[in-house]
Interface confidence: low
């Protein structure tokens, strides 16, 4: 029995619902009473959802899963996962047994966009050319880990004297803090870009130092 799932990972935003597609080709005369369907976590074999003896056996995974009962008879064994969490990320296996048996695994990639970075400057007054300043770029509640890039007003990458830390909260979402230490020129703009590698989403922040006062666009 051929069981089909998408080759590419299913990308789902934290808090949204995701559909893990799985299909099979029922033979003529197929009845749901013949169907045994099991969804489980590929690594641990933990049961997620099942259908047997013509009945939806329900969710065994935090009561956040559902099948598409009206579509099962047409060979649609897809699983709906509600309110996706970071911890859901991983591989799910769809097992289908009628008279024959088949299985396939689909990957779930969880993502969350990063907030627009906030910029802080230390020290933030009485600045003169030649002073060393610390610019901190902070962006919150994204997933997975961000890539952080700094550049000056001319678009030249700044790679030296950058320290980036990422910490996860209880939901597994990351807060990113990137610190750039620079020696001030006569004036200058410093930008940080926080990129979500899965969503290919960029969040920008910048600070312009023009003697007095500073501006934070």
């Amino acid at each position: 029995l051929e069981v089909q799932v998408p080759e590419d990972p299913v990308v789902a935003l934290v808090g949204t619902d995701a559909t893990l597609c799985c299909s099979f080709s029922p033979e003529p005369g197929f009845s749901l009473a013949q169907l045994n369907l099991i969804w489980q976590l590929t690594d641990t074999k933990q049961l997620v959802h099942s259908f047997a003896e013509g009945q939806d056996q329900g969710s065994a995974y935090a009561n956040r899963t559902a099948l598409f009962p009206d579509l099962l008879a047409q060979g649609n064994a897809s699983l709906r996962l509600q309110r996706v969490r970071v911890a859901d990320e991983g591989s799910f296996t769809c097992f289908v047994s009628i008279r024959d048996f088949g299985s396939a695994a689909v990957s779930l990639q969880v993502a969350a966009p990063y907030s627009k970075p906030s910029m802080t400057l230390e020290p933030n007054k009485d600045l003169r050319p030649g002073d060393t300043v610390t610019i901190t770029c902070s962006s919150y509640r994204g997933y997975p880990e961000a890539e952080v890039f700094w550049q000056d007003g001319q678009g030249v990458p700044l790679t030296g004297n950058v320290t980036t830390s990422q910490m996860a909260n209880e939901q597994g979402l990351f807060d990113v803090h990137s610190v750039l230490r620079v020696v001030l020129g006569a004036n200058g703009t410093y930008s940080c870009l926080v990129r979500n590698p899965v969503l290919q989403q960029d969040a920008h922040g910048s600070v312009t130092i023009t003697g007095q006062p500073m501006t934070f666009p």
Epitope: D43, L47, Y61, A62, A87, A168, G172
Partner: antibody, heavy 120, light 108 residues
């Protein structure tokens, strides 16, 4: 063969700091989730902190803000930095591997543990 | 957090007898429960996961059952090496991962 070997335990005074290490072999530490679980003398097991394969960190409420879990992928080693230690932190600290990248799971491999004693 | 309550605290039995250990969850954890065995001076050892699945190398005399809030570990025909402390652990609702207080199985 999967092995976890803890080190760094010892006797410290309340308020002092200590760093525990867990050297892993037989698997790549950033491909699994790993936790610290402790056991006070004569008591049961208490999960302390965990870090997923992708670096997501979690802490029990009793240690949040005082303990920091980290790892060095190049040395395949897990750490637990323990600050502001209290008498109630006295325990054998075990390093335990989950059998999944995200660690909301059970532990299939454990180290032998290292004893931390906090006493004045 | 999910609180796991194990009973009895101590079980005194003879080799060859059957041991029945109970673990009760403060709310439903479906089947996300593991059992561990710990002997004095040793680390815990995984016995059962997903309520009923034996870990690699665990003898068939160990079996798990239950779902929701009530779980049981059964050891058929106790061997001398089975006398130890047994812990249950849930991984349904986390953090934190939580353990039961343990049941000591001792020789009569």
């Amino acid at each position: 063969d999967v092995q976890l070997v803890e080190s760094g335990g010892g006797v410290v005074r309340p308020g002092e700091s200590l760093t525990l290490s867990c050297a892993a072999s037989g698997f790549t530490i950033n491909s699994y989730a790993v936790s610290w679980v402790r056991q006070a003398p004569g008591e049961g097991l208490e999960w302390v902190s965990g870090i997923s394969g992708s670096g997501v960190r979690y802490y029990a409420d009793s240690v949040k803000g005082r303990f920091t879990i980290s790892r060095d992928d190049s040395n395949n080693t897990l750490y637990l930095q323990m600050n502001s230690l209290r008498a109630e932190d006295t325990a054998v600290y075990y390093c335990a591997r989950s059998n999944k990248v995200t660690w909301n799971n059970f532990f299939d491999y454990w180290g032998l543990g290292t004893l931390v004693t906090v006493s004045s | 957090e999910v609180v796991l309550t194990q009973s009895p605290g101590t079980l005194t039995l003879s080799p060859g007898e059957r041991a029945t250990l109970s673990c009760r969850a403060s709310r439903s954890i479906l089947t996300s429960l593991a059992w561990y065995q710990q002997k004095p001076g040793q680390a815990p050892r995984l016995l059962i996961y997903n309520t009923v699945t034996r870990a690699t190398g665990i003898p068939a005399r160990f079996s798990g059952s239950g779902s929701g809030t009530e779980f049981t570990l059964t050891i058929n025909s106790l061997q001398s090496e089975d006398f130890a402390v047994y812990y249950c652990q849930q991984y349904y609702d986390w953090p934190p991962l939580t353990f039961g207080g343990g049941t000591k199985v001792e020789i009569k």
